[in-house]
């Protein structure tokens, strides 16, 4: 049974750029018909990843994934049951809170970001390594890249493959 | 600041498996020096995270980090600080709670395994998912495949990229 | 020009029915969440409820919940709210709101609202 | 649930003057945090989110600061066409939540 699918593409980028894997960071930006630099701005956001090492991808991973299935993303129409998340009742959409997680993590402050998080009641361990990557894509990325990288989440956002 | 990694080879070994990667996998299955046995073992296993799409990564990616991020793996001695952590004071051991939900996966039955899951406090969503997973697994696996895929797990446990 | 245009308010009895909709045009409808939010007469603003894009994400407050449902038809522009179980503290105007931004968010345009009164 | 807490209830001001309305939230709204100013009958107008973003078309006079729990609305000169009551609104949540208003009245 293929379970329902929230917005697949935005997880296929998110996954590709969090395990540093390039070539298929590129398969799932060409998709999107991703521009030379929204693709920039993304392998800039995935250098960071690299950089902090494997634990950072799990636990960053976990911020995602915690965020994907707190309550704030069971909205009431979505709380029922498994049948009908096979269904697919959760739609395409991306939830809410994800977008407003990835929203403050290119736009935000490190503390606003990292309060978004804590309020998912991430572990010290989790918080310290958001607040890891949020500072290093603060100091890699320029404006126009973290512009860049919105303007590819909208084409993401509103992607037939979303 | 680089953070601690506990037994990165058995997390880089699940991401492969669990995000269909098989490039990935086959790289991260010669570092242990994986038999051809081992390897078509886990491709198995691989083959059922694919099946179920990405939702079924994100999902499992959440056991895996919830369980990895859980009070089971974070004993007194690593609870303290963030600090601490960078100290590598979690070792590069594999969590035991981590452990025996993969031993579980492969040997015991459905139920049992979900129930393990269960204990972590995940959503239906999530339960659902683990026992699509796991039905999936003991239809493709035979008895010998799960040995052998225990054997690489020991190698895992056991290397010193662990 | 961004309009929303509430109707289906009126006089109902405690325990009673009601099913408000909100017209909306001047927009691309399915790119934002919609929300309903209600007023007292002489009293603040109250949010009832949201509702995102493709239906996916609900959210209703506490002291509705169990009696309102909230709806939207993208194919008609339209948003919906079923009251069941009125009650007097019920009684207020609701207004219509598309939400700024389509995460839960503030509210950039207003409905002018309709009145909503539950009385014996 | 959050709770917005304005003050002062109500504010006599005259034409010119330096307004501020402050916004207290029972716990940390970070930064999601909008104003929105309401005339009698009509319906509310946003002024500003994200605590400090001015909305397209609002007049600069209006000004917007604070994070976490604190919050104010500042209003430069106070111009007639500025006399309403207005609310704050924490979005932090999925369950918005509104102060109970400050009425800016003439002196």
């Known amino acids: 049974v293929k379970m329902a699918e929230t917005c697949p593409i935005f997880y296929d980028v998110f996954f590709a750029v969090a395990n540093g894997n390039e070539l298929l960071l590129d398969l799932s930006l060409t998709k999107v018909n991703a521009t030379e630099p929204e693709r920039t701005a993304m392998k800039k956001i995935q250098d960071c990843y690299v950089e902090n090492g494997l634990i950072s991808r799990v636990l960053d991973g976990l911020v995602m994934t915690t965020i994907s299935s707190s309550k704030d993303c069971m909205g009431e129409a979505v709380q029922n049951t498994v049948e009908d998340l096979k269904l697919n009742t959760l739609g395409r959409e991306i939830c809410p809170a994800v977008k407003r997680g990835v929203d403050l993590f290119l736009t935000g402050t490190p503390d606003e970001y990292v309060e978004q998080v804590a309020q998912y009641k991430a572990l010290p361990v989790v918080l310290e390594n958001a607040r890891i990557l949020k500072n290093c894509v603060d100091a890699k990325m320029t404006e126009e890249d973290k512009e860049n990288a919105l303007s590819l989440l909208d084409k993401i956002y509103t992607s037939p493959l979303c | 600041v680089k953070m601690a990694e506990t037994c990165p080879i058995f997390y880089d070994v699940f991401f492969a498996v669990a995000n269909g990667n098989e490039l990935l996998l086959d790289l991260s299955l010669t570092k242990v020096n994986a038999t051809e046995p081992e390897r078509t073992a886990m491709k198995k296993i691989q083959d059922c995270y694919v099946e179920n799409g990405l939702i079924s990564r994100v999902l499992d990616g959440l056991v895996m980090t919830t369980i990895s991020s859980s009070k089971d793996c974070m004993g007194e001695a690593v609870q303290n600080t963030v600090e601490d952590l960078k100290l590598n004071t979690l070792g590069r051991e594999i969590c035991p709670a981590v452990k025996r939900g993969v031993d579980l996966f492969l040997t015991g039955t459905p139920d049992e395994y979900v129930e393990q899951v269960a204990q972590y406090k995940a959503l239906p969503v999530v339960l659902e998912n683990a026992r699509i997973l796991k039905n999936c697994v003991d239809a493709k696996m035979t008895e010998e495949d799960k040995e052998n895929a225990l054997s690489l797990l020991d190698k895992i446990y056991t290397s010193p990229l662990c | 020009e961004v309009q929303l245009v509430e109707s289906g308010g009126g006089l109902v009895r405690p325990g009673g029915s009601l099913r408000l909709s909100c017209a909306a045009s001047g927009f691309t409808f399915t790119s934002y969440a919609m929300n309903w939010v209600r007023q007292a007469p002489g009293k603040g603003l109250e949010w009832v409820s949201s509702i995102s894009s493709y239906s996916s994400y609900i959210y209703i407050a506490d002291s509705v919940k169990g009696r309102f449902t909230l709806s939207r038809d993208n194919a008609k522009n339209s948003l919906y709210l079923q009251m069941h179980s009125l009650r007097p503290e019920d009684t207020a105007v609701y207004f219509c709101?598309?939400?700024?931004?389509?995460?839960?968010?503030?509210?950039?345009?207003w409905g002018r609202g309709t009145l909503v009164t539950v009385s014996s | 649930d959050i709770q917005m807490t304005q003050s002062p209830s109500t504010l006599s001001a005259s034409v010119g003057d330096r307004v501020t309305i402050t916004c207290r939230a029972s716990?940390?709204?970070?930064?999601?945090l909008a104003w929105y100013q309401q005339k009698p009958g009509k319906a509310p107008k946003l002024l500003i989110h994200?605590?400090?973003s001015l909305e397209s078309g609002v007049p600069s006079r209006f000004s917007g600061s604070g994070s976490g729990t604190e919050f104010t609305l500042t209003i430069s000169g106070l111009q007639p066409d500025d006399f309403a009551t207005y609310y704050c609104q924490q979005y932090n949540t999925y369950f918005p939540t509104f102060g109970q208003g400050t009425k800016v009245e003439v002196k």
């Open positions: 716990q940390s709204v970070i930064s999601w």
């Open positions: 994200r605590a400090s």
């Open positions: 709101a598309r939400e700024g931004y389509s995460a839960y968010s503030y509210f950039d345009f």
